[in-house]
Interface confidence: low
């Protein structure tokens, strides 16, 4: 004869004055047996949708509908997906800091602009928070033995660079 709630399984509740394990009622759960009450299942509605249904032994898990992402532990809030030029942090969407960009919608992190000079190239178009810099063609580099002669051409002020 059961005279204790200690042996009750998850998915049940039990009252000390009547120590019988009883199934949790509809839309409630208990992950630990023998508790006096079952917990009300989380409802995923509005900006939330079900990731995992509620059962007698575990709560429902929600995720955000398309175009939104979760914030907080166990996805307590939904926030609109980040725009290009932003990245998702624990505090929500944050604008990329100077010198970084993110060209993706809803995902991705801010990445540093390309360093054109590492490839020996000049900056053709400066970067923004949404777009990387555009590098120009490689800058011509001259060796010590190269002779440069500047010759007048086509009138005053006109010069052409000739590499011999």
């Amino acid at each position: 004869v059961q005279n204790s709630c200690d042996n009750c399984q998850p998915g049940t509740f039990c009252r000390k004055y009547n120590p019988v394990c009883k199934s949790c009622p509809p839309s409630t759960f208990s992950s630990i047996g023998g508790q006096p009450n079952c917990n009300i299942c989380r409802v995923c509605a509005g900006y939330f949708r079900f990731k995992k249904f509620c059962s007698s032994t575990h709560n429902a898990e929600c995720e955000c509908i398309e175009g939104f992402h979760c914030l907080g532990p166990q996805c307590t809030r939904c926030e609109k997906d980040c725009r290009p030029g932003q990245e998702l942090t624990k505090q929500g969407c944050k604008t990329c800091s100077l010198g970084t960009f993110n060209d993706q919608n809803g995902t991705g992190v801010c990445r540093p602009w390309t360093n054109c000079s590492l490839d020996g190239r000049s900056v053709l178009k400066t970067g923004t928070t949404e777009k990387d810099v555009v590098c120009g063609p490689p800058v011509v580099s001259f060796s010590p033995s190269t002779t440069i002669s500047v010759t007048p051409e086509g009138g005053p002020g006109g010069h052409s660079l000739q590499v011999l």
Partner: antibody, heavy 119, light 107 residues
Framework: QVQLQQSGAELAKPGSSVKISCKAS????????LNWIKQTTGQGLEYIGY????????HYNEKFKGKATLTVDKSSSTAFMQLSSLTPVDSAVYYC????????????WGQGVMVTVSS | DIQMTQSPASLSASLGETVSIECLAS??????LAWYQQKSGKSPQFLIY???RLQDGVPSRFSGSGSGTRYSLKISGMQPEDEADYFC?????????FGSGTKLEIK
């Protein structure tokens, strides 16, 4: 007692749409989700999606996005499913079912609606 | 989606015989499994939820068991009214998915 009364059989032409209904009685409509399930001989039972009868929000199985549209009229305790751009593969029996004893199970089912798509 | 593999596809049993139907999930479903009975030309009826819990009004000759990925439905003492199709269904992950069904006939 809980009852889900569905509309009558539908014969539809390819490319057309049908809208079938499910009238709930014997319980508080907004306390449960209403789910829709497709049954064919070849594919068996396939879950289409549910409508949250309280908020009117719906959620679809990826396979049926764009095919089914779920709505609810709380004043008449009736849920609807519209099937669009019908093709012969949409020929099936469609059931509405109440979100079950625990969400995710289906404790009461309508009698089903036979939809036949044929030219 | 979680795949539910049901076996056998069909089964003949004599009255009074005990029969078992198996359901195998493609991943662990933590007992989030239901069984349904569907008689010819009718809609499915809810029999068992949470793998082993009988829905109110379901005869005690029906029982469910299992864990992890493997589950079974047992009918202890086949009755004429048990002739039907039986389906398992997982609700561990969205979308819910069903087994392909077992046709149970009287021998």
């Amino acid at each position: 007692q809980v009852q889900l009364q569905q509309s009558g059989a539908e014969l539809a032409k390819p490319g057309s749409s049908v809208k079938i209904s499910c009238k709930a009685s014997g319980y508080t409509l907004t306390s449960y989700y209403l789910n829709w399930i497709k049954q064919t001989t070849g594919q068996g039972l396939e879950y289409i999606g549910y409508i949250d009868t309280g908020s009117g929000g719906s959620h679809y199985n990826e396979k049926f996005k764009g095919k089914a549209t779920l709505t609810v009229d709380k004043s008449s305790s009736t849920a609807f499913m519209q099937l669009s751009s019908l093709t012969p593969v949409d020929s099936a029996v469609y059931y509405c079912a109440r979100g079950g004893y625990y969400d995710g199970f289906f404790d009461y089912w309508g009698q089903g609606v036979m939809v036949t798509v044929s030219s | 989606d979680i795949q539910m593999t049901q076996s056998p596809a069909s089964l003949s049993a004599s009255l009074g015989e005990t029969v078992s139907i198996e359901c195998l999930a493609s991943e662990g479903i933590s007992n989030d499994l239901a069984w349904y009975q569907q008689k010819s030309g009718k809609s499915p009826q809810f029999l068992i939820y949470a793998a082993s819990r009988l829905q109110d009004g379901v005869p005690s000759r029906f029982s469910g068991s299992g864990s992890g990925t493997r589950y079974s439905l047992k009918i202890s003492g086949m009755q004429p009214e048990d002739e039907a199709d039986y389906f398992c269904q997982q609700s561990y992950k969205y979308p819910p998915t069903f087994g392909s069904g077992t046709k149970l006939e009287i021998k």
